[in-house]
């Protein structure tokens, strides 16, 4: 058993039918010694008396808010949550496996630049009685600070019969060094509590591996005289690290016909313009990637040829 | 060329070669990007590689003030990785494919280190740790980790030279 926060405790249980469970001793936070009684949740049934209460925690029915009273007055509370370990594996019932980029990916994170700011998100089908708490650091043995905000519900979607809820959190490394080569990964830890179930999820990454630039901005076409060719130009996204002479991007320019089956013409360039042939009803799209490190491409920015 | 006395390197040549290094490092093992090698006991392997750290002056401001600190750090790293790529980690079993870009990568590391420091001038270099994995699968894992680390190192070096070529070239 360990303390998650003040008056909230997590009991770690080997989880199988008829498991012996864990013996837990609760102590009433009071100088009083006599006349103390204990109850669980809203029930008025007295579970025991005295300054300490010993319970055998086996199932969710044994978890909840234990309260010690004296003469009708509440003295203190202890909330017991359960953390299930099945066959040596901690339960992951609360969050959905996003399966990208690999199985057992519960947390996904992205950064728009090298500033040390990043966003993580996760999915669940649970809509109520759900709380998240996020902590992060650079490295784990001698951790350096990363400050995370509160997790918020960022999207809701319908997937078949189920509703899916997306939560996200923004974090910022306290003393980021954008130009340095990272040697210690960022660690992100999410505590999830659903009713009386506790779970924790972790992710470990380098900022360089989660970089995904915003799409190029101000995408424009300039027809070239007496030609089917056009000059496409664009700019670095505002959110990208500066100076651009140091934090450089490379670009992919694509000409795509109306039909998905039509052959796509692609050009790669380090410049912020390119000359391409604009077919009727086609569109031109441009996306960006770090020039020197193969992290994710941005989403496409597009304009119609006409 | 960057000499210990402090003259400027051939920024544009360094830029071209460092960008080539980036391409080679990723083609040497493109799938490394999809392997979570940090799950595989890192301790004794890539902890000793030289990293370009915050105080090494490789940021745009540091390069403007005095690029020598940064260039020396880059040179150290290039020599370190050049030795690693020439060691039995890469020459031993399992053999690299004949068309593997590791050979080109090795040669380019040497080429860039010589651009930074011609013969006759010496910056101190870092000792290469004695990594001699016994099993072929350990060697394979170590190659992945070294290439992964090299990808990060050459990316920073390439940024330095691109910025230098754009803003510090005479």
């Amino acid at each position: 058993i360990w303390e998650l926060k003040k008056d909230v405790y997590v009991v770690e249980l080997d989880w199988y039918p008829d498991a012996p469970g864990e013996m837990v001793v609760l102590t009433c936070d009071t100088p009083e010694e006599d006349g103390i009684t204990w109850t669980l949740d809203q029930s008025s049934e007295v579970l025991g008396s005295g300054k300490t209460l010993t319970i055998q925690v086996k199932e969710f029915g044994d978890a909840g808010q234990y309260t010690c009273h004296k003469g009708g007055e509440v003295l203190s509370h202890s909330l017991l949550l359960l953390h299930k370990k099945e066959d040596g594996i901690w339960s992951t019932d609360i969050l959905k496996d996003q399966k990208e980029p690999k199985n057992k990916t519960f947390l996904r994170c992205e950064a728009k630049n090298y500033s040390g700011r990043f966003t993580c998100w996760w999915l669940t089908t649970i809509s109520t009685d759900l709380t998240f708490s996020v902590k992060s650091s650079r490295g784990s043995s001698d951790p350096q600070g990363v400050t995370c905000g509160a997790a918020t519900l960022s999207a809701e979607r319908v997937r078949g019969d189920n509703k899916e809820y997306e939560y996200s959190v923004e974090c910022q490394e306290d003393s980021a060094c954008p130009a340095a080569e990272e040697s210690l990964p960022i660690e992100v830890m999410v505590d999830a509590v659903h009713k009386l179930k506790y779970e924790n999820y972790t992710s470990s990454f380098f900022i360089r591996d989660i970089i995904k630039p915003d799409p190029p901005k101000n995408l424009q076409l300039k027809p070239l005289k007496n030609s089917r060719q056009v000059e496409v130009s664009w700019e670095y996204p505002d959110t990208w690290s500066t100076p651009h002479s140091y934090f450089s991007l490379t670009f992919c320019v694509q000409v795509q016909g109306k039909s998905k089956r039509e052959k796509k013409d692609r050009v790669f360039t380090d410049k912020t313009s390119a000359t391409v042939i604009c077919r009727k009803n086609a569109s031109i799209s441009v996306r960006a990637q770090d020039r020197y490190y193969s992290s994710s491409w941005s989403e496409w920015a597009s304009v119609p040829c006409s | 060329r960057a000499v210990p006395g402090g003259s400027s390197p051939a920024w544009t040549q360094c830029q071209q070669l460092s960008q080539k290094l980036c391409t080679l490092a990723w083609s040497a093992h493109p799938l490394v990007g999809h392997m979570d090698l940090r799950e595989e006991g890192d301790e004794e392997t890539t902890n000793d590689v030289p990293h370009i750290q915050c105080g090494d002056g490789c940021d745009p401001q540091g390069l403007r003030d005095n690029s020598q600190f940064c260039l020396q750090r880059i040179h150290q790293g290039l020599i370190f990785y050049e030795k690693l790529l020439g060691s039995d980690i890469f020459t031993g079993e399992p053999s690299l494919l004949p068309d593997s870009p590791v050979g080109q990568l090795h040669a380019s590391l040497l080429g860039l280190s010589q651009l930074l420091q011609p013969e006759g001038h010496h910056w101190e270099t870092q000792q290469i740790p004695s990594l001699s994995p016994s099993q072929p699968w350990q060697r394979l894992l170590l190659r992945f980790k070294i290439l992964r680390s090299l990808q990060a190192f050459v990316a920073v070096a390439a940024r330095v030279f691109a910025h230098g070529a754009a803003t510090l070239s005479p």
Epitope: W15, Y16, P17, E59, D87, G88, I89, D97 | -
Partner: antibody, heavy 116, light 108 residues
Framework: EVQLLESGGGLVQPGGSLRLSCAAS????????MSWVRQAPGKGLEWVSS????????DYADSVKGRFTISRDNSKNTLYLQMNSLRAEDTAVYYC?????????WGQGTLVTVSS | DIQMTQSPGTLSLSPGDRATLSCRAS???????LAWYQQKPGQAPRLLIF???TRATGIPDRFSGSGSATDFTLTISSLEPEDFAVYYC?????????FGPGTKVDIK
């Protein structure tokens, strides 16, 4: 006392389908992960599939992936295995068991024979 | 997938003898995620040991498990008549969980 009782086995032609059920009692079924394990006649044990307590996560052996579907109805305390595109090599006694992988409690098994 | 091998295939012993059954994994089994089961003819298997050395509920203390990484052992200190059966090891540290082919302990 934990009890698991499988049903739904029988003779089926190759390419056919069968749905196995496992009725659970003696424990809070909805709280626990469940699995199916099979044993070909005279052969060893093979883990087939498992499902978490809520039904939200399922896992399959490569040999049955895409053909078998594990599911559960917590309101009925019942575990299911829907088997489609059956092959001769699926002939086995199918056991339902508690747990993701470590089978602490087992049913008595139901025999599935795939033959023309 | 992790392959499990068991030796010997058959062990012929008398009641009161000590039985030592071996199980080997093709690669390391993380955190000693290894279980042993006993199966008698016409019956479902029964869990004996999990986490390499922890006895399951109701299993007599003549059964003990040991080992780590790739090499594991099940020891029956003094065979009782009801112990003659087939014994399977199973790794569950890596998905999918895989069983060994079994060791048959029969009466000499």
């Amino acid at each position: 006392e934990v009890q698991l009782l499988e049903s739904g086995g029988g003779l089926v032609q190759p390419g056919g389908s069968l749905r196995l059920s496992c009725a659970a009692s003696g424990f809070t079924f909805s709280n626990y992960s469940m699995s199916w394990v099979r044993q070909a006649p005279g052969k060893g044990l093979e883990w087939v599939s498992s499902i978490r307590s809520s039904g939200g996560r399922t896992d399959y052996a490569d040999s049955v992936k895409g053909r078998f579907t594990i599911s559960r109805d917590n309101s009925k305390n019942t575990l299911y295995l829907q088997m489609n595109s059956l092959r001769a090599e699926d002939t086995a006694v199918y056991y339902c068991a508690t747990g993701i992988a470590v089978a602490r409690y087992w049913g008595q098994g139901t025999l599935v024979t795939v033959s023309s | 997938d992790i392959q499990m091998t068991q030796s010997p295939g058959t062990l012929s012993l008398s009641p009161g003898d000590r039985a030592t059954l071996s199980c080997r994994a093709s690669q390391s089994v993380g955190s000693d995620y290894l279980a042993w089961y006993q199966q008698k003819p016409g019956q479902a298997p029964r869990l004996l040991i999990f986490a390499a050395s922890t006895r399951a509920t109701g299993i007599p203390d003549r059964f003990s498990g040991s080992g780590s990484a790739t090499d594991f052992t099940l020891t029956i200190s003094s065979l009782e008549p009801e112990d003659f059966a087939v014994y399977y090891c199973q790794q569950y540290g890596s998905s999918p969980a895989t069983f060994g082919p079994g060791t048959k302990v029969d009466i000499k």
